[in-house]
Amino acid sequence: FKVATPYSLYVCPEGQNVTLTCRLLGPVDKGHDVTFYKTWYRSSRGEVQTCSERRPIRNLTFQDLHLHHGGHQAANTSHDLAQRHGLESASDHHGNFSITMRNLTLLDSGLYCCLVVEIRHHHSEHRVHGAMELQVQTGKDAPSNCVVYPSSSQDSENITAA
């Protein structure tokens, strides 16, 4: 399987909410011995390997934000901790998973990574990630809504295998 990032840049005004999205592509093993660990974290630009550094999102680590379930099941993060920080990660039946960030500030600007780990009990694990950038713009003339910019046409799915 692979991870696609439909949009590689999100630009939002301060105070808005944004939902960053990744999509699980390809055959997904729905066997009983397979579970999927999905999570989000921040990283840094200019690394040799994008998303290799894992930094917290609003003080929540990738462990705090993880979803753990089988196949294309739907799931949500535990509400209390994440929602106190204005965050919610979710996953649907179609392989889409997302993190919603509420009341954006300039400090939220940066590179965000989604990570999917396929865990086969007693066997190996397979990891894939996707990267996207969030820019929060401020100013009296800053547009009132988020705008998104798609990933490249050449690799419009912007697929990266870890």
């Epitope: 590689s8 840049l9 630009v11 820019q135 713009q137 100013g139 003339d141 800053a142 547009p143 009132s144 809504n145 988020c146 705008v147 910019y149 798609p150 990933s151 490249s152 046409s153 050449q154």
Partner: antibody, heavy 120, light 107 residues
């Protein structure tokens, strides 16, 4: 002040490849924003062709995707459009354009446009 | 693709009139909509972005409103120099799409 200027042949033969360049001054195209190509057939409306991002990402309109290539020459601070297998329907004024000083603020900066006629 | 439909396609009004042009999107575009003015033989000029934000240097007689699927460009008091074709454009979804244009003439 950001300025854009298109250049390229004004006449292209059917089935050949149209090639245009947009030279940018007043701003480095690798510093930010998205650099777009838009066209307008004579007497008709505007059609978005595609963009090149500051980080090299490129996105094309699906209707032209199979024929269009956008590339960049960072050393000359310019980006280019190639449209293959042209027909008379590709006759248009071709513009390069960039958003305003905010992302998502519409196309504030335009080149003067260059008319490309497809004819044998 | 999102279809942008402008109405009317052409209109004639007198100097000093209040003029309204509407733009309807085939699906929700939030407020990610711009309006342009294009005079004959000239480059399009940005008037309004984010549905209602007047671009720098644009006269205050131009205003925009709306969100979702229905948008309006209003010229509060038509001036002779406003003779042009006006286009709306959505930038909420790709490909970016423009309305077919509204040609404005002076009576």
């Amino acid at each position: 002040q950001v300025q854009l200027q298109e250049s390229g042949p004004g006449l292209v033969k059917p089935s050949e490849t149209l090639s245009l360049t947009c030279a940018v001054s007043g701003y480095s195209i690798t510093s930010g924003y998205f650099w777009n190509w838009i066209r307008q057939p004579p007497g008709k409306g505007l059609e978005w062709i595609g963009y090149m991002g500051y980080d090299g990402r490129i996105f094309y309109s699906p209707s032209l995707k199979n024929r269009v290539t956008i590339s960049v020459d960072t050393s000359k601070n310019q980006f280019s459009l190639k449209l293959s297998s042209v027909t008379a329907a590709d006759t248009a004024v071709y513009y390069c354009a960039r958003e305003g000083d905010y992302y998502g603020s519409g196309f504030a900066y335009w080149g003067q446009g260059t008319l490309v006629t497809v004819s044998s | 693709d999102i279809q942008m439909t402008q109405s009317p396609s052409s209109l004639s009004a007198s100097v000093g009139d209040r003029v309204t042009i509407t733009c309807k999107a085939s699906q929700n575009v939030n407020t990610n909509l711009a309006w342009y003015q294009q005079k004959p033989g000239k480059v399009p000029k940005l008037l309004i972005y984010s549905a209602s934000y007047r671009y720098s240097g644009v006269p205050s007689r131009f205003s925009g409103s709306g969100s979702g699927t229905d948008f309006t460009l209003t010229i509060s008091s038509l001036q002779p120099e406003d003779v042009a074709t006006y286009y709306c454009q959505q930038y909420n979804n790709y490909p970016l799409t423009f309305g077919q244009g509204t040609k404005l003439e002076i009576k």
